[in-house]
Interface confidence: medium
Amino acid sequence: FVRTKIDTTENLLNTEVHSSPAQRWSMQVPPEVSAEAGDAAVLPCTFTHPHRHYDGPLTAIWRAGEPYAGPQVFRCAAARGSELCQTALSLHGRFRLLGNPRRNDLSLRVERLALADDRRYFCRVEFAGDVHDRYESRHGVRLHVTAAPRIVNISVLPSPAHAFRALCTAEGEPPPALAWSGPALGNSLAAVRSPREGHGHLVTAELPALTHDGRYTCTAANSLGRSEASVYLFRFHGASGAST
């Protein structure tokens, strides 16, 4: 659902912070948050600032990739004296504020996680009005997205000398181990990882020479689960057919 205001309880500001006269800017974020693909994750971020009881206009921002220059994935703004932080940007509608900037809390909730969300995120707050000031986390919080294996492509392709090879590509985190089984491979699982392994959570295994007709099965496995898919090779007078 979409919030039109900011949450008032998840994150109260604090503190002793306000009783110390020379409070400096600081941001507190954990080094890493882990969650499974498809689930939601909370990226915590709280801050302190030197402007005692600031109630002027503020903007809360989250970036991805790198601080200061990375693309924004979330932004909201609150008017003077208001607790309502109106969302101006929520990438794909999946980012929403969990914290309350008026409580010095910028914690963000990310819905429906995908492997592509596995990157570093940086929170930032901007004050405008009587006070003009801003601060951004320098190191950010790394969102580590885990996922059970999923085979994204399996195919049979022609290779020189009227032979055939099979390719299996899977994604997952941790990167899955791939194995081929099929005719004449016996009980031994043949797996050859391509140089692209690990690139964007994708792993590819090639079976370079299919010497017998029949069913070839690719199995992908990691600590979160396993997945398998098959192709069938039939050769008729030099032609081939494959189905998944």
Epitope: K5, T9, R103
Partner: antibody, heavy 116, light 108 residues
């Protein structure tokens, strides 16, 4: 499922101390702000204290400031409230509550009685 | 500090609509949350952020916040809704959370 279980309540004399604990389970404790709320017998709810997800930010109601200290141990999924210089008016059921969109989950409470 | 004022009691016949008010300064610029508390039990969040229902809370519970008054509305009130109800908000100036005094809802 989310569960919060308070402990540590009991009878204490005025001026005494008590430490309450709140054991959390069923959610990522280290990602959420937490609160203590109390309710005197036959009275309404009174917010007591707040602590941010990491423990770096805390805040207190005026009625307990300087006497109570909120803390947390994220490695143990536990929230604490150290109560010193207790007064008769601190007598109440003390609840820990998770902070998100209101206090969305509450423990069942622990009774603190301050009496001589 | 902000003060939230609730009527001490509200009565309603079964099946009718109960409305519990909560008044305070500048409420439209604040979130208001509502809790139900039955005797001997911990409070339960029934409305958050003015008008959102947590999962598991019946649809007959709704909330609004306009002017300087927030309202909890219970449509088709049932006997099991008899309880104390508290509104709550956050005061960004005193940096504290504030509860209303509570309203006892009686289902006649």
């Amino acid at each position: 499922q989310v569960q919060l279980v308070e402990s540590g309540g009991g009878l204490v004399q005025p001026g005494g101390s008590l430490r309450l604990s709140c054991a959390a389970s069923g959610f990522t404790f280290s990602s959420y702000a937490m609160h203590w709320v109390r309710q005197a017998p036959g009275k309404g709810l009174e917010w007591v204290s707040y602590i941010s997800y990491s423990g770096s930010n805390t805040y207190y109601a005026d009625s307990v400031k300087g006497r109570f200290t909120i803390s947390r141990d994220n490695s143990k999924n536990t929230l604490y409230l150290q109560m010193n210089s207790l007064r008769a008016e601190d007598t109440a059921v003390y609840y820990c509550a998770r902070g998100w969109g209101g206090f969305d989950y509450w423990g069942q409470g622990t009774l603190v009685t301050v009496s001589s | 500090d902000i003060e939230l004022t609730q009527p001490p009691s509200v009565s309603v016949a079964p099946g009718q609509t109960a409305r519990i008010s909560c008044s305070g300064d500048n409420l439209p610029n604040r979130y208001v949350h509502w809790y139900q508390q039955k005797p001997g039990q911990a409070p339960v969040l029934v409305i958050y952020d003015d008008n959102n229902r947590p999962s598991g809370i019946p649809e007959r519970f709704s909330g609004s916040n306009s002017g300087n008054t927030a309202t909890l509305t219970i449509s088709g009130t049932q006997a099991e809704d008899e309880a104390d109800y508290y509104c709550q908000t956050y005061d960004m100036f005193s940096m504290s959370d504030v509860f209303g005094g509570g309203t006892k809802l009686t289902v006649l």
